[in-house]
Amino acid sequence: GQFRVIGPGYPIRALVGDEAELPCRISPGKNATGMEVGWYRSPFSRVVHLYRNGKDQDAEQAPEYRGRTELLKETISEGKVTLRIQNVRFSDEGGYTCFFRDHSYQEEAAMELKVEDPFYWVNPG
């Protein structure tokens, strides 16, 4: 059946060295355990994280994300997942696309990650 993919409607903000969490879900909610689910940065070959066959498929990841991502899938049976990026870098800033694909249908949603310097402080006065 068909579905929509919904990401956050606002930029996700994270500090350098911290964690960022990018949520993504399908609507109407349905079990996504058997789907191919992932995040990529354009072009598609820059894979941030890929999940299929009930497992994270680390071999497909772009080298700069290896060992730094985790898919939170406790609610994947409801069609909800979150990508956690650890040890955030300035180079992680920018656009991300989350996609869900089943055997007959694929949809995706774009989202943005803003990375900020924890040591940069502007005097409000």
Partner: antibody, heavy 121, light 108 residues
Framework: EVQLLESGGGLVQPGGSLRLSCAAS????????MSWVRQAPGKGLEWVSA????????YYADSVKGRFTISRDNSKNTLYLQMNSLRAEDTAVYYC??????FGVGSFDYWGQGTLVTVSS | DIQMTQSPSTLSASVGDRVTITCRAS??????LAWYQQKPGKAPKLLIY???SLESGVPSRFSGSGSGTEFTLTISSLQPDDFATYYC??????????FGQGTKVEIK
Amino acid sequence: EVQLLESGGGLVQPGGSLRLSCAASGFTFSSYAMSWVRQAPGKGLEWVSAISGSGGSTYYADSVKGRFTISRDNSKNTLYLQMNSLRAEDTAVYYCAKDWVYFGVGSFDYWGQGTLVTVSS
Amino acid sequence: DIQMTQSPSTLSASVGDRVTITCRASQSISSWLAWYQQKPGKAPKLLIYDASSLESGVPSRFSGSGSGTEFTLTISSLQPDDFATYYCQQTHSYSSTTFGQGTKVEIK
């Protein structure tokens, strides 16, 4: 309508080379992994190789690793299989198959009609 | 590599019969299994994926079941068009796949 049309098969001597092509239409070619599956005369199906939608990841059966190379040209909607150091046991009908996934190997929802490769002296 | 074993190799049946084909995996593959039908001189056709999901356009007399290591393809009422060879395929391995040796369904 999805269509896959293989070409390039024929008779080749042992140790020789051949390049198979598969022209695809009716779907967004670059969004799907593609595979080659072969079937020796009177035998069952054997998966040979696969390639991700972008072409960035390739996968091979042990029986052809180091001898066969899969590639794709997404601007031409075409899949290729370069076969080197051919052996008699490579004789088969070679099918091009569309996968449902973007990466790796899943199940194949569309198949070409096949092209026959005969390796014989 | 995961080995797939089908039984029987050949099955003789009549139109209207209920037909069951079994596929066993050498290790657990969860529900990552597909079934195909192939007629002589033709390409295989996908019938079932994820062990029990019917591919679009496939008649409802075909059904699949099972998980782990044992799977079945059932044709509830065999039709003349169903005489063919059937293959199972494991899709658990992600970066490779293997097929069963095939089951030929012939006219009794």
